[in-house]
């Protein structure tokens, strides 16, 4: 079955800057990726970015730069200050819509013991929802 992995990293140089990387471990064709924070998209989470394979990238503050890394993984840099700034225990979720598997979503946050600039390896996170 497909899996989604999520990796969250705090940048050593800017403590309010996070990088989120997500990937899809499946054989289907990805049709949309949605990155959210504060919980799963559509379940209390707030959308940070939508990446469409053909039409481009739509992102909302404090997302600064979302990009496709490969045809099955994306990265998102967040830069915040004040109310819109992420904190160390913020949960980030990635939802991959693919054909024919459907939608698969997983969430992750900064590892509790991680120093700035470090992160956990990008291991598959628990699948929260498969539509």
């Amino acid at each position: 079955t497909p899996e989604v992995w999520v990796q969250v990293r705090m940048e050593a140089t800017e403590l309010s800057s996070f990088t989120i990387r997500c990937g899809f471990l499946g054989s289907g064709s990805i049709s949309l990726v949605t990155v959210s924070w504060g919980g799963p998209n559509g379940a209390g989470g707030t959308t940070l970015a939508v990446l469409h394979p053909e039409r481009g990238i739509r992102q909302w503050a404090p997302a600064r730069q979302a990009r496709w890394e490969t045809q099955s993984s994306i990265s998102l840099i967040l830069e915040g200050s004040g109310a819109s700034s992420p904190c160390a225990n913020t949960t980030f979720c990635c939802k991959f819509a693919s054909f024919p598997e459907g939608s698969w979503e997983a969430c992750g946050s900064l590892p509790p013991s991680s120093d700035p600039g470090l992160s956990a390896p990008p291991t598959p996170a628990p699948i929260l929802r498969a539509d």
């Epitope: 469409h52 394979p53 053909e54």
Partner: antibody, heavy 120, light 113 residues
């Protein structure tokens, strides 16, 4: 035929607000985000923000947060932009532009523009 | 934000001449998923609103004459008018449509001798 018809020119006083409209026709209004773009004194173009007519979700250029508010009226296929606390620096031509079929931000149809002049 | 820089700011050409104008972006506009460059060109004639000419760096919008040719990849792009006509008198703007916020170059003003 896709058309975006904007409201007429505005002459307003400093400190006041103005609300300009963009009536869409020739396509399904709720299928495409609407963008707003500013052009100051015939110079370059600056993206203000976008709105999803389906649900009213907005996305603003940080430079215009607090200055512009985007809304839609689905019943009349009309998008609106309100500009507040106007100063002479806000004098410009404002365009509505539909998101592209092929790409989110390649804007394929534009309104004719609304000139806003802020003067006492 | 991605910064777009156009050159020259203006140029004057005679009817029938070949015109080239440049646009550079501060970061790559190549989408690594589909290998497309998210760069658009707009034409704005005096007193009119902008008109989309080219998107994905080289795809002409429907109805645009084939004398308008977009090219380039990554951060360097060019709009060429192979044989300029009197009606091409306009400002030309490049714009990245890669990601939010979309940003425009300062424009190139094309004058006809």
């Amino acid at each position: 035929e896709v058309q975006l018809q904007q409201s007429g020119p505005e002459l307003v006083k400093p400190g006041t607000s103005v609300k300009i409209s963009c009536k869409a026709s020739g396509y399904t209004f709720t299928d495409y985000y609407m963008n707003w773009v500013r052009q100051s004194h015939g110079k370059s173009l600056e993206w203000i923000g976008e709105i999803n007519p389906k649900n009213g979700d907005t996305n603003y250029n940080q430079n215009f947060k607090g200055k512009a508010t985007l809304t839609v009226d689905k019943s009349s296929n009309t998008a609106y932009m309100e500009l507040r606390s106007l100063t002479s620096e806000d004098s410009a031509v404002f365009y509505c532009a539909r998101e592209g079929v092929s790409s989110y931000y390649a804007m394929d149809y534009w309104g004719q523009g609304t000139s806003v002049t802020v003067s006492s | 934000d991605i910064v777009m820089t156009q050159s020259p700011s203006s140029l004057a050409m005679s009817v029938g001449q070949k015109v080239t104008m440049s646009c550079k972006s501060s970061q790559s506009l190549l989408n690594s998923f589909n290998q497309k460059n998210f760069l658009a060109w707009y034409q704005q004639k005096p007193g009119q609103s902008p008109k989309l000419l080219v998107y994905f760096a080289s795809t002409r919008e429907s109805g645009v004459p084939d004398r308008f040719i977009g090219s380039g990849s990554g951060t360097d792009f060019t709009l060429t008018i192979t044989s300029v006509q009197a009606e091409d008198l306009a400002d030309y703007f490049c714009q990245q449509h890669h990601s939010t916020p979309p940003t425009f170059g300062g424009g190139t003003k094309l004058e006809i001798n």
